[in-house]
Structure formats: structure tokens, C-alpha cells
């Protein structure tokens, strides 16, 4: 999906009002020195591409993020504010339902959510673009 035509300000508002707080709740109890962010993004569409990938694509050691509250709210925000996004996700959602697993918070998931927080920071304030 090409995130170029999303309403970035509306997505930012959704993130700051609720999603960010859900991410903080998920990370509560984790030391702030524990993880080193290695995933980066250069502009808002790129940030959303990386955010979508980390939030919804199962990875080795962390298969369950898509069912977390912050993920469901992220999906809703993208569906509302990115034209045509929901249509592209129908097949992916059906595939995910087939491999539904019980929620487990692993260290790998915590690391992935730490990466997500970093990506959202850059989405909210791209450093090199004059916005």
C-alpha cells in the first residue's frame, strides 16, 4: 500500500490522543535503556510503511502484536485516514485469523514496540523534511 495520500495530521492526532498511551502501557516496566532502535524512516509515508510492517507482520519471536489494543487502533486510523487502505488489508486479515495465536508478551515483542515508538516519533516530526 502507498501511504502518500493519507491524512497525516489526522493520523498524528489519533496517535497522540490514544495509540501513544497504549504503547506506553504495553512497555510499562521496561527499562528505558533496554533497547536500541535500529529501524528508521525518512518521511511520513515511509514511516507508515515501516509502522504497518512492524505492527501487523508476525516476526520470529513476536507473532501477536496485531491483536494488541494499540495495533487495533492503528489499523482503524489507517483505515479511516488512508484512502483504499482497508481494501488492501482484507486478504491479510483473513490470513491472520487462520493463524491466530494466544497473546504472549515476549522480550522480542517489547523490542519491536520500542522500535514502533521510535518510528512514530519520526512520523510525528520528520527531522530532515521541512514539513
Amino acid at each position: 500500500y502507498d501511504f502518500t495520500n493519507c491524512d497525516f495530521e489526522k493520523i498524528k492526532a489519533a496517535y497522540l490522543s490514544t495509540i501513544s498511551k497504549d504503547l506506553i502501557t504495553y512497555m510499562s516496566g521496561t527499562k528505558s535503556t533496554e533497547f536500541n532502535n535500529t529501524v528508521s524512516c525518512s518521511n511520513r509515508p515511509h514511516c507508515l510503511t515501516e509502522i504497518q510492517s512492524l505492527t501487523f507482520n508476525p516476526t520470529a519471536g513476536c507473532a501477536s502484536l496485531a491483536k494488541e489494543m494499540f495495533a487495533m487502533k492503528t489499523k482503524a486510523a489507517l483505515a479511516i485516514w488512508c484512502p483504499g487502505y482497508s481494501e488492501t488489508q482484507i486478504n491479510a486479515t483473513q490470513a491472520m485469523k487462520k493463524r491466530r495465536k494466544r497473546k504472549v508478551t515476549t522480550n522480542k515483542c517489547l523490542e519491536q514496540v520500542s522500535q514502533l515508538q521510535g518510528l512514530w516519533r519520526r512520523f510525528n516530526r520528520p527531522l530532515l523534511k521541512q514539513q
Epitope: 512514530w120 516519533r121 519520526r122 516530526r125
Partner: antibody, heavy 119, light 107 residues
């Protein structure tokens, strides 16, 4: 606990340079932007620029381009600002600050470093 | 550059009364406004981000509102420890810019 500790006060001659350090602790240094802000005596706050310690990317206020250089040393979790061609108007308290968890504000600030430029 | 203009420059309010500080941007900054408090001899402290979101540990008597070009910081019931200079800041476009500050005193 997140802390930003800055180097001590400096007195400099016009035309010279100054380098101020900002040592971060209590969080992963490379994960958060470091901002630099200054405050002239009795005046308001002026943004100088920002650096991403993770990759060295910077963005400067045009008013300081060419005179201010922001750097970061990941091995010591320390950010630096160097200001060259100093003039009396550069007399100010220089602050480093960290971006907050959302990227939309500065949540932790250093204690400030007073730089006095005088002949 | 976006100019942030605060009003008034200084304000004297009785203890327990409401204090209101305004901030006007020279062009729309969406909701990208932050408020800081600075007490004499101290570094600034974050109060409110993204117009109205409270930073951790900031008392509920502080609130922010507005959008576009006009923003307000309100202290619902002034306490002695609220004496400080208050700054608005926009982070909508580079360079980031601050208001000139509003000095809040007790009447």
C-alpha cells in the same frame, strides 16, 4: 532516571569558538533527538537546531547555519554544540533538551551552560 | 519563519483565581503547540504538548486549548508555585519557534 548534564560556564573573546557538551544518561541515547536552545540574558528562548544521535542527521535554524555545528558521540552518550565567530550577542545560556516519547515536545532539559562573549 | 506572539507580556492574578495566557501563530500550525514553564534560574519544564495533552505529573489545573493559529494556556486556580514565565512553542515547521514569554505573578 533520565538526566542531561552540561559542561561548565565559558568566557570567550569575540571571533573565537566555544564547544558545549551535554552528557545523557538513563535512556538509550541514540533513540531520541537532542535539541539545542539558547536564552540571552532577560530574553526568551531561541531554537538553534537538532541532531539525531542515531545517524548524525541535523537540522539548523538558518540564523545559525554555518556558525553552529551539532555533533553526537554515541560511545559516550554525549551531544555537542560548537559555535564559531562569536560576538557579544551570543552571550546566553545554552540548553540541550531531549525530545519526548511522542516526538512532539522537549521533556528533559540540561541545567544550561552560560557562555559570555566579551573583549 | 512562523512567529508566535504571546499576550499579555505579563499578568498578575490572585491566588485561587484563573490565569489565561494566549498565543497566536503567524500562520496555521495545526495542533503542533507546546507549553513550557520556566522559573527563575531554572531550565524550562514541559507542561502541555500537542495543544492539550498533559505531560506526566503536570497538575490538572493546567490546561491547553486551540487550533490553527490561536492557542490558550489556562491555570484554573493559581497556586504560589505557578509564578514563572510561560512559553508557547510551535513544532509544525522548521525552524521551531517560541513565543516571547508571559511572566505570571501573584496579585
Amino acid at each position: 532516571e533520565v538526566q542531561l548534564v552540561q559542561s561548565g560556564a565559558e568566557v570567550k573573546k569575540p571571533g573565537s569558538s566555544v564547544k558545549v557538551s551535554c552528557k545523557a544518561s538513563g535512556y538509550t541515547f541514540s533513540n531520541y533527538l537532542i535539541e539545542w536552545v539558547r536564552q540571552a540574558p532577560g530574553q526568551g528562548l531561541e531554537w538553534i537546531g537538532v541532531i539525531d544521535p542515531g545517524n548524525g542527521d541535523t537540522n539548523y535554524n538558518e540564523n545559525f547555519k554555518g556558525r553552529a555545528t551539532l555533533t553526537a558521540d554515541k560511545s559516550t552518550s554525549t551531544a555537542y554544540i560548537e559555535l564559531s565567530s562569536l560576538r557579544s550577542e551570543d552571550t546566553a545560556v545554552y540548553y540541550c533538551a531531549r525530545e519526548d516519547n511522542t516526538g512532539t515536545a522537549f521533556d528533559y532539559w540540561g541545567q544550561g551552560t552560560t557562555v559570555t562573549v566579551s573583549s | 519563519d512562523i512567529v508566535m506572539t504571546q499576550s499579555p507580556d505579563s499578568l498578575a492574578v490572585s491566588l485561587g483565581e484563573r490565569a489565561t495566557i494566549n498565543c497566536k501563530a503567524s500562520q496555521s500550525v495545526s495542533s503542533d503547540v507546546t507549553w513550557y514553564q520556566q522559573k527563575p534560574g531554572q531550565s524550562p519544564k514541559l507542561l502541555i504538548y500537542y495543544v492539550s495533552e498533559h505531560y506526566t505529573g503536570v497538575p490538572d489545573r493546567f490546561s491547553g486549548s486551540g487550533s490553527g493559529t490561536d492557542f490558550t494556556l489556562t491555570i484554573s486556580s493559581l497556586q504560589a508555585e505557578d509564578v514563572a514565565v510561560y512559553y508557547c512553542q510551535q513544532h509544525h515547521r522548521f525552524p521551531l519557534t517560541f513565543g516571547q514569554g508571559t511572566k505570571l505573578e501573584i496579585k
